[in-house]
């Protein structure tokens, strides 16, 4: 079992290589893959209390990191 990539921790984890526009970053195996290989997100119902639907981020978008951490580009956060 290839376990190495999943053992990277928090601030010690290197930022993923930015994905090209047709690719998304898979957080579980930690590399860029074709966006079509990741599950299609389901739309959130109107008025849902969660602000974080599983939608693919564009390559220029990022997920906010904790205080003092650089935001990491994570296209394909599903």
């Amino acid at each position: 079992m290839r376990r190495g990539p999943r053992s990277l921790r928090g601030r010690d984890a290197p930022a993923p290589t930015p994905c090209v526009p047709a690719e998304c970053f898979d957080l579980l195996v930690r590399h860029c893959v074709a966006c079509g290989l990741l599950r299609t997100p389901r739309p959130k119902p109107a008025g849902a209390s969660s602000p974080a639907p599983r939608t693919a981020l564009q390559p220029q978008e990022s997920v906010g990191a904790g205080a003092g951490e650089a935001a990491l580009p994570l296209p394909g956060l599903l």
Epitope: M1, R3, R6, R9, G10, L27, L28, L38, G66, L78
Partner: antibody, heavy 117, light 111 residues
Framework: EVQLVESGGGLVQPGGSLRLSCAAS????????WNWVRQAPGKGLEWVGY???????YYNPSLKSRFTISRDTSKNTLYLQMNSLRAEDTAVYYC???????????WGQGTLVTVSS | DIQMTQSPSSLSASVGDRVTITCRAS??????????MHWYQQKPGKAPKLLIY???DLESGVPSRFSGSGSGTDFTLTISSLQPEDFATYYC?????????FGQGTKVEIK
Amino acid sequence: EVQLVESGGGLVQPGGSLRLSCAASGDSITRGYWNWVRQAPGKGLEWVGYINYSGTTYYNPSLKSRFTISRDTSKNTLYLQMNSLRAEDTAVYYCATSHNTGEMDYWGQGTLVTVSS
Amino acid sequence: DIQMTQSPSSLSASVGDRVTITCRASESVDDYGISFMHWYQQKPGKAPKLLIYRASDLESGVPSRFSGSGSGTDFTLTISSLQPEDFATYYCQQTSKDPWTFGQGTKVEIK
């Protein structure tokens, strides 16, 4: 909506083998992560392993040597091959699908495997 | 392996009560600014149901009385006002590091 239907469970003798199937509809098993999770009677949940979009498999190390996950993309079906079964493998086996942070949002109804002589 | 410890293992509560279940991981389950922590509800004879993903995101279709919080190693599932259909067993799960692991479960029973 994804629907998962497991089959193949039943009674098997210690040392025997069994292959479980999980037929998926509503999404392709060539996308995302497809898991097996088991639950012994009256006990908690235990992750068995997954196969992902690329066919890469990851296993619970305690089970890897005896259990193998595979798929048939033409049938959109996931399999769990279980060998050298022991009494402690008696459980309900579920298949479930994950997004790429691992949460399992769709589950099958489960299939019971009983290992007993 | 990351060990997940839930507390309490069981609790008795009444309809309308506020219920809090905690889950502690043996090491941080955070990465990339995300908590790889999820919560499930399971009723007898049924498959688990996803309630909360990534520590605090409410799954589609789940009532808003369920909420999750926490980061790093300490997480909480809260039911703001317990309803009759909420009596069940609740599990936390981490997917930060292989093998993925679940807590031992918390059974919520009727007082």
